[in-house]
C-alpha cells in the first residue's frame, strides 16, 4: 500500500533496512558507520552546490526474535515485515537502502507498490534483474554470466584459440550469498549461460569434483567454482590434475591477488581467477578498518548507496523537480556518479558495472598475472598478456573437450 514519504520541504530522509538476515555476516554497527560517513559526504556536496537542505537516515531494525538466523535463505518475509513496520509508523523515506538478500528483495518488489527507489548491496540473483526501481551496487549474477559466455566463445586470442561450449559447475550448497546466486544463475536451465552451452553438469559432491580431475571420460575440461583459494584447496588438496583441466575460480570481491607480496600456491597453477579490478584499500575509513575484502565491498555498497541518493537528490533539486514522483524512483540508472573511491557506473537497469579481471598463475614467477580484463558495461574483453607463461601446453588454454581438434 501507499505510504507517505518523509521527503519534502527541504528535509529528505533515507530509510535503511537493518536486517538480521544479510548477504554478508556484517555487524550492523559497521553498516551504520558506512551510512553515516556517506551522509557526511552528501551533506557537504549539497552544501557546496548551494542547496540548503537536511538529509538524514532512519535505521529500521527487524525483530531479532523472529528473524535471527542471519542466513539469506530464510529472509523471504523479513523485508516485508520491515516494510509493514515502516508503513505502520509512517516513516518511509525518499529511498529505501537494503535489503541485500535476493529472496527478500524479490519478495518486497513483488508485494509492494514501489513508487520509491530501492538500493541494494547485494540481491545478486537473476530474479532481481530488470526491476524498474531497483538499483544494485554489487556485481549481480547477470554480469558474471555475460562474461563467461563472452569468454567461452572467444577463439581469436593467442592464448585461447578454441571456442568452448561445455562446462562443469561445482555447487555444494554451502556457498556464501554472492556465490550461491552466481552459481545458481549458471545452473538455471533457462539462463543465458545454459542456453549458450552445449553441455553443462552441476557437481554437488566433493567426491564428484575430485573424480573429474583425473577422469579420462570427462565431458568437459572446464570447471567453474566460486570462492577463495583456501576453499579450492580444501576441496582439491594436492591431488593430481589432468594437464588440460581449467578451473575458473570466481572470487569477485577479493583484492588479495593484487597485493605486492602475494605468491600463488602450487595448487593454483591450473586455475584462472575471476575477480574485480582492485579498489582503494579504504584503510583510512572508520567503517572499513577491520573488514575483510568482501565485507569492505558490502559496507562500501551501503556508503555508495547514500552517495547515489545524494547525487540524484542534487540533480532533481537543481532542476526544481519533485522527489516523490515515479520519475525520481526510475532515475537511478544509466549514469555515472562519484562514489567513495572512484566513479560508479550504473547500467540501463540500475546494476553496477565493473572491470572484471581474469588472472592466471605464472609458472615462472609464481605470481598472479592479468590475462585479460572485461568491461561489463560494453560486454567486451581486452587481452592483456599476449604471451602468458601458463602451465597449459604451448602456453595456450586447452580445448574444452579432450581430443577434439581445432574448430
Amino acid at each position: 500500500s501507499q505510504v507517505s514519504q518523509n521527503c519534502h520541504n527541504g528535509s529528505y530522509e533515507i530509510s535503511v533496512l537493518m536486517m538480521g538476515n544479510s548477504a554478508f555476516a556484517e555487524p550492523l554497527k559497521n553498516l551504520e558507520d558506512a551510512v553515516n560517513e556517506g551522509l557526511e559526504i552528501v551533506r557537504g556536496r549539497l552544501q557546496n552546490a548551494g542547496l540548503n537542505v537536511t538529509v538524514n537516515a532512519t535505521f529500521m531494525y527487524s525483530d531479532g526474535l523472529i528473524h535471527n538466523s542471519g542466513d539469506c535463505r530464510s529472509s523471504t518475509c523479513e523485508g516485508l515485515d520491515l516494510l509493514r513496520k515502516i508503513s505502520n509508523a509512517q516513516r518511509m523515506g525518499c529511498v529505501l537502502i537494503g535489503p541485500s538478500c535476493t529472496y527478500s528483495t524479490f519478495q518486497m518488489y513483488l508485494d509492494t507498490e514501489l513508487s520509491y527507489p530501492m538500493i541494494s548491496a547485494g540481491s545478486f540473483g537473476l530474479s532481481c534483474d530488470y526491476k524498474e526501481t531497483l538499483t544494485r551496487l554489487m556485481s549481480p549474477a547477470r554480469k558474471l554470466m555475460y562474461f563467461l559466455v563472452n569468454f567461452w566463445k572467444t577463439n581469436d586470442l593467442p592464448f585461447k584459440t578454441y571456442s568452448w561450449s561445455t562446462s562443469y559447475v561445482y555447487k555444494n550448497g554451502t556457498e556464501t550469498e554472492d556465490c550461491f546466486w552466481y552459481l545458481n544463475a549458471l545452473e538455471a536451465s533457462v539462463s543465458y549461460f545454459s542456453h549458450e552451452l552445449g553441455f553443462k553438469v552441476v557437481l554437488r559432491q566433493d567426491k564428484e569434483f575430485q573424480d573429474i580431475l583425473m577422469d579420462h571420460n570427462r565431458k568437459s575440461n572446464v570447471i567453474i567454482m566460486c570462492g577463495g583459494p583456501e576453499f579450492l584447496y580444501k576441496l582439491k588438496g594436492d591431488r593430481a590434475v589432468a594437464e588440460d583441466i581449467v578451473i575458473i575460480l570466481v572470487d569477485l570481491f577479493n583484492d588479495q591477488y593484487f597485493e605486492d607480496n602475494v605468491t600463488a600456491p602450487d595448487y593454483m597453477k591450473n586455475v584462472l581467477v575471476l575477480t574485480l579490478s582492485p579498489g582503494n584499500s579504504l584503510l583510512n575509513s572508520s567503517f572499513s578498518r577491520n573488514l575483510s575484502p568482501t565485507k569492505r565491498d558490502f559496507a562500501l555498497a551501503y556508503l555508495n548507496g547514500i552517495l547515489l541518493f545524494g547525487h540524484m537528490l542534487k540533480i532533481f533539486l537543481e532542476n526544481g523537480e519533485n522527489i516523490t514522483t515515479p520519475k525520481f524512483a526510475h532515475a537511478f540508472r544509466n549514469l555515472t556518479f562519484e562514489g567513495y573511491d572512484g566513479p560508479v557506473t550504473l547500467d540501463d537497469w540500475g546494476d553496477v558495472d565493473s572491470t572484471m579481471v581474469l588472472l592466471y598463475t605464472s609458472v615462472d614467477t609464481k605470481k598472479y598475472k592479468v590475462l585479460l580484463t572485461y568491461d561489463t558495461h560494453v560486454n567486451k574483453t581486452y587481452p592483456v598478456d599476449m604471451s602468458p607463461t601458463f602451465t597449459w601446453k604451448n602456453s595456450k588454454l586447452p580445448n574444452d573437450i579432450t581430443g577434439r581438434g581445432p574448430q
Partner: antibody, heavy 127, light 109 residues
Framework: EVQLVQSGAEVKKPGSSVKVSCKAS????????ISWVRQAPGQGLEWMGG????????NYAQKFQGRVTITADESTSTAYMELSSLRSEDTAVYYC????????????????????WGQGTMVTVSS | EIVLTQSPATLSVSPGERATLSCRAS??????LAWYQQKPGQAPRLLIY???TRATGIPARFSGSGSGTEFTLTISSLQSEDFAVYYC???????????FGGGTKVEIK
Amino acid sequence: EVQLVQSGAEVKKPGSSVKVSCKASGGTFSSYAISWVRQAPGQGLEWMGGIIPIFGTANYAQKFQGRVTITADESTSTAYMELSSLRSEDTAVYYCARDRGRRYCSGGSCPNAFDIWGQGTMVTVSS
Amino acid sequence: EIVLTQSPATLSVSPGERATLSCRASQSVSSNLAWYQQKPGQAPRLLIYGASTRATGIPARFSGSGSGTEFTLTISSLQSEDFAVYYCQQYNNWPPALTFGGGTKVEIK
C-alpha cells in the same frame, strides 16, 4: 599511504629521447590510470597521455601522438613516459599522476580526477 | 577538444576575504571537473573532484559548484597558505583527452 616517486632530472640534446619513470608504492597499481602531465617554465599544465596498467594500452593527447610512448611494468609497479625527437620547447617539469580508481565503473572510459602526483622530473632540452 | 577558460587570470585578495574563481568549458563536461592548487616548486594538489566534492584532507573553506559548462571554486576565507595558482581540469572524455584551464593566480592584495 600511496606515493609516486619519479626519476631524477635530465639534460638532453635536441633530437634525442628521454625516458622518465614513475614508481608507485604503498598500494595497488594495476587498475588506476597513470597519466603524464607536463608544465613548461611559467606555464600551465598540459596532459600528455595515460595508461591503465591492467588494460595495457595507452591513450595520448593528439598533440603528442607519435612522439610519446607510455608504458607500465606491473611487476615493479612502475610507469614510464618516453618522449622522442626532443626540441627546446619540450623543456618542462614532467609529472606522473594517479587517478581515483575504477573498480565499479566502465573500463577505460571511466571519468576521473588525479588524487596522487609524483614530485616532478625536470627535463631540459638544450644544445 | 574541450577548452577550459579560467577567469580572472590573476586575483588579488586580502587574507580573510572570500575568493571566487571561475572556469568555463567550451562544451558540457557534466560534473566531471576537478580543481587543483599548485604552489611554486610543488606538484599540483587535488582540492575538488566531481565539481563539488572535497578531496580527502581539504579544509571546508574550499568549495566547488556548477555543472555543465559553468564552474566556480570558492575559498570562503583566505589563509596565508592559500595564495597559489589554481587550475580546473575536465575529465569528461578520457579517452581521448583531458584538458586543464590556463590557471588563476591568487595573490596577496
